[in-house]
Amino acid sequence: KKEDGESTAPTPRPKVLRCKCHHHCPEDSVNNICSTDGYCFTMIEEDDSGLPVVTSGCLGLEGSDFQCRDTPIPHQRRSIECCTERNECNKDLHPTLPPLKNRDFVDGPIHHR
C-alpha cells in the first residue's frame, strides 16, 4: 500500500466491452451477453447445404488482429466483422459472404440460388 502523499501513475485497466453473443456464448454469459477486453464480432458462414449461418460473440484482445481480418479457408465461405465503439455494437454488423471463386465451383458443392 502506498503511503499518503505518495503519487503513483494509475495502471490502465483493460476496457470491458459487452457484446451480443449467439452460438459463441461462454459458460458464464447471461442473457446472450458476453464481456471482453477486445472486440465484438458478427460472423457469417456458409454451411454444407449452402445456407448462411450468422453468429456473434466476443473476441479477446490477444489474437483479435488476425481474427478480425478475413483469413482464407478452403472450399467454404466465411466473413467476419468486428467492432469496439460501444456495448453490443455487433448488433449492427452485417457481414456478407465473399463471392464464390471459380475454383469453388469445381472443388466445392454447387449451390443454385
Partner: antibody, heavy 124, light 107 residues
Framework: QVQLQQPGAELVKPGASVKLSCKAS????????MHWVKQRPGQGLEWIGM????????NYNESFKSKATLTVDKSSSTAYMQLSSLTSEDSAVYYC?????????????????WGQGTILTVSS | DIQMTQTTSSLSASLGDRVTISCRAS??????LNWYQQKPDGTIKFLIY???RLHSGVPSRFSGSGSGTDYSLTIRNLEQEDIATYFC?????????FGGGTKLEIK
C-alpha cells in the same frame, strides 16, 4: 492466454482402451475446432481428426476412424480422445491443438495452439 | 490423400545464416500451406499460415512463400533458438497432412 493442458504420460496394456484429455483455458472453448495429432518416436506428424465443441461435429482421418473417438465436455472445457484396441503401433505422443480461427460450421485448417503432448506407451 | 514432401530431412547452418526449407505437395494446395516448429523437448509452435502470413509473436526473420505445389520457409539471420525441426502442413483438403520434417542443426 490460450493454454491446452495434457497429462504427461499414460501406460496401458495391449488390447485395452485409453481416454486422453486436453483441458483448455484462456479462450471461449466452444468457438474453435480442436484437432488431435499423433507423432510416433522419431517420426513425422499425423492428423487424427477434429471436433467442434459447440456442435460436437467431427471430421476424422480415414486411417483413424476405427481407432479414435473424439468427444468434449463443455462444462469443464475439456476435449477427449479415446483410443481403442491398443497395440504397440499406438505408442506415440498425442497432441491436441486449437484452431486459429473462430468458426461455427466451416472447417478451418490452422493448428495455432498446441498442448505439450501425452506420451502413450502400450506395453504388457 | 495429399502427400507432403520435405526432401531435406536435416540441414546444418551457422548462426547468422539465411536458411531455406522447402516443401512440395503432390497436387495444387492453393496456398493452404502452414509451417510449424518443433523444439527438441517436443514443444510445437505455429509459425506461418496460408503460405506467408506470420502468426502473432513469431519473429519477422521468419517468412514463407510459394504457390501451387511448391512452398518454402526462410529464416534470415539464424539464431540459436531457431534450432528445431520444421514441418509443413497442407490445409486444402481433408485429411490434413504433414511433411516429414526438416531438422535444423548448427554447424
Amino acid at each position: 492466454q490460450v493454454q491446452l493442458q495434457q497429462p504427461g504420460a499414460e501406460l496401458v496394456k495391449p488390447g485395452a482402451s485409453v481416454k486422453l484429455s486436453c483441458k483448455a483455458s484462456g479462450y471461449t472453448f466452444i468457438s474453435y475446432w480442436m484437432h488431435w495429432v499423433k507423432q510416433r518416436p522419431g517420426q513425422g506428424l499425423e492428423w487424427i481428426g477434429m471436433i467442434h465443441p459447440n456442435s460436437g461435429s467431427t471430421n476424422y482421418n480415414e486411417s483413424f476412424k476405427s481407432k479414435a473417438t473424439l468427444t468434449v465436455d463443455k462444462s469443464s472445457s475439456t476435449a477427449y480422445m479415446q483410443l481403442s484396441s491398443l497395440t504397440s503401433e499406438d505408442s506415440a505422443v498425442y497432441y491436441c491443438a486449437r484452431d486459429l480461427l473462430i468458426a461455427t460450421v466451416v472447417v478451418t485448417p490452422y493448428f495455432a495452439y498446441w498442448g505439450q503432448g501425452t506420451i502413450l506407451t502400450v506395453s504388457s | 490423400d495429399i502427400q507432403m514432401t520435405q526432401t531435406t530431412s536435416s540441414l546444418s547452418a551457422s548462426l547468422g545464416d539465411r536458411v531455406t526449407i522447402s516443401c512440395r505437395a503432390s497436387q495444387d494446395i492453393s496456398n493452404f500451406l502452414n509451417w510449424y516448429q518443433q523444439k527438441p523437448d517436443g514443444t510445437i509452435k505455429f509459425l506461418i499460415y496460408y503460405t506467408s502470413r506470420l502468426h502473432s509473436g513469431v519473429p519477422s526473420r521468419f517468412s514463407g512463400s510459394g504457390s501451387g505445389t511448391d512452398y518454402s520457409l526462410t529464416i534470415r539471420n539464424l539464431e540459436q533458438e531457431d534450432i528445431a525441426t520444421y514441418f509443413c502442413q497442407q490445409g486444402n483438403t481433408l485429411p490434413y497432412t504433414f511433411g516429414g520434417g526438416t531438422k535444423l542443426e548448427i554447424k
